[in-house]
């Protein structure tokens, strides 16, 4: 990002104000919604995303099949409260006073429940499967290069260690993409999973958080590939509480 | 070229205010940032505050908090440093220096320096 | 503030030698981090800017490294120009603070 003040963006993050008012008259961006100061020369925390999001004016069987704890975010948007390093807090509520418990990337584990619900630890989501349809195509694309495109460009855009990028199945017109990282796999610096697969999803609704870049132009072999419906589950370290209720619905 | 061009040497008496000058061409003043930096004889750089012309903001460090005030006049181009109730340890060259354009907080433009005496 | 700690104080080295200067910041501070030379009577001239990222013009025997709180610049051949006080500098947060320099001097 650049210091002269009409180029002060934040390549990685477009909900975000900039100014050269960091230290030094660095380029500093802060995330809307949070006033947060954020490193553009990585992805924003999802939890951010989401708090900026919020803050804006309103615009079947698998090939994998997904463990029984696998998450699905089916609350949708909501305003979270993120901790000071831009992570969600374990507890969330809303403004009647309706709280719950998420994992590391703000999906309700628990049932809701009142004030009094305890969440005594942030739940990480260590296995992502993002599960992918696309729009037919004259023929089925060669696996091999599908598996590399998708691994670039989660390497390329999204910064992600390609040891985070478990595998990638496909069997026509499905994709299936496995992230996974351990608290113990995550080092200082390395792209947060659930991140990655955040920007993956916005990118494929046609929402691109990068500031300015065009949006996600995927092609396999010159092949176009557009997604027609995307499902994302999420596996947490610790299986979620749910009561049987909701199970059995 | 790009470059900034500092006023000349001052001697001023303890308990006194030293005003240095800070004069930029070559690139559009309002756009980059003025930090001032100091650096006593035989000792090591000491940063002392800053300032964004376009939108007025400053920062001082601590130490100098109180004593120093950055301005900048845009039809000239020109930031300014003023110390007030100067000591013999003020005694130093005065540096003033624009943050470099990748916008890292990096200083890659710097005046040729003020050497500014405190002495009774 | 974050105090930035410079490695050695002082070193003898001749023309030709390779040469390599740490930094140590007192927190992190990401990769907000510059490396100067500065001549006696003369302004700091940078050469380093975000920790690895060259300055236009500065010849390419300076490379820096390093991210959070150790930091290195190296000098793979040592011309006569750059016998000379070294400074890194960090901009992660206010105030801007300096290291302690380091003086490089002729074996």
């Known amino acids: 990002h650049t210091a002269a003040q009409d180029n002060c963006t934040c390549p990685t993050n477009k909900m975000t104000v900039c100014s050269p008012d960091g230290p030094g008259g660095r380029c500093q961006c802060r995330a809307l919604g949070s006033g947060m100061a954020v490193d553009c020369s990585t992805l924003t925390s999802k939890c951010l995303l989401l708090k900026a999001r919020m803050s804006a004016p309103k615009n079947a069987r698998t090939l994998v099949r997904p463990s029984e704890h696998a998450l699905v975010d089916n609350d949708g948007l909501y305003d979270p409260d993120c901790d000071p390093e831009g992570r969600f807090k374990a507890r969330q509520c809303n403004q009647t006073s309706v709280c719950w418990c998420v994992n590391s990337v703000g999906v309700r584990r628990t049932d809701k429940g009142d004030l009094s619900l305890r969440c005594d630890e942030l739940v990480r989501t260590h296995h992502i499967l993002i599960d992918l349809r696309h729009r037919p195509t004259a023929g089925a694309f060669n696996h091999s290069d599908l598996d590399a495109e998708l691994r670039r460009l989660f390497r390329e855009r999204y910064r992600l260690h390609p040891k985070f990028v478990a595998a990638v199945h496909y069997e026509q017109p499905t994709i299936q993409i496995e992230l996974r990282q351990n608290t113990s796999q995550k080092a200082a610096g390395d792209v947060d999973i659930g991140d990655a697969a955040y920007y993956f999803e916005r990118d494929i609704k046609g929402e691109s958080l990068f500031q300015g870049r065009g949006g996600l132009d995927l092609r396999v072999r010159g092949e176009p590939l557009q997604v027609e419906r995307t499902l994302i589950y999420y596996l947490d370290e610790i299986p979620p509480k749910f009561s049987m209720k909701r199970l059995t619905a | 070229q790009v470059q900034l061009v500092q006023s000349g040497a001052e001697v001023k008496k303890p308990g006194a205010s030293v005003k240095v000058s800070c004069k930029a061409s070559?690139?559009?003043?309002?756009?980059?940032?003025i930090n001032w930096v100091r650096q006593a004889t035989g000792r090591g750089l000491e940063w002392m505050g800053w300032?964004?012309?376009?939108?007025?903001?400053?920062g001082y460090a601590q130490k100098f908090q109180g004593r120093v005030t950055i301005t900048a006049d845009e039809s000239t181009s020109t930031a300014y440093m003023e110390l007030s109730s100067l000591r013999s340890e003020d005694t130093a060259v005065y540096y003033c220096a624009r943050p470099n354009t990748g916008g890292d907080g990096a200083f890659d433009i710097w005046g040729q320096g003020t050497m500014v005496t405190v002495s009774s | 503030d974050i105090q930035l700690t410079q490695s050695p104080s002082s070193v003898s080295a001749s023309v030709g030698d390779r040469v390599t200067i740490t930094c140590r910041a007192s927190q992190g501070i990401k990769s907000w981090l510059a490396w100067y030379r500065q001549k006696p009577g003369k302004a700091p001239k940078l050469l380093i800017y975000?920790?690895?990222s060259l300055q236009s013009g500065v010849p390419s025997r300076f490379s820096g490294s390093g991210s959070g709180t150790d930091f290195t610049l190296t000098i793979s051949s040592l011309q006569p120009e750059d016998f000379a006080t070294y400074y890194c500098?960090?901009?992660?947060?206010?105030?801007?603070?300096f290291g302690q320099g380091t003086r490089l001097e002729i074996k």
């Open positions: 975000r920790a690895r």
């Open positions: 070559g690139y559009t003043f309002t756009n980059y940032g």
């Open positions: 300032m964004n012309p376009r939108s007025g903001n400053t």
């Open positions: 500098q960090q901009a992660n947060s206010f105030p801007v603070t």
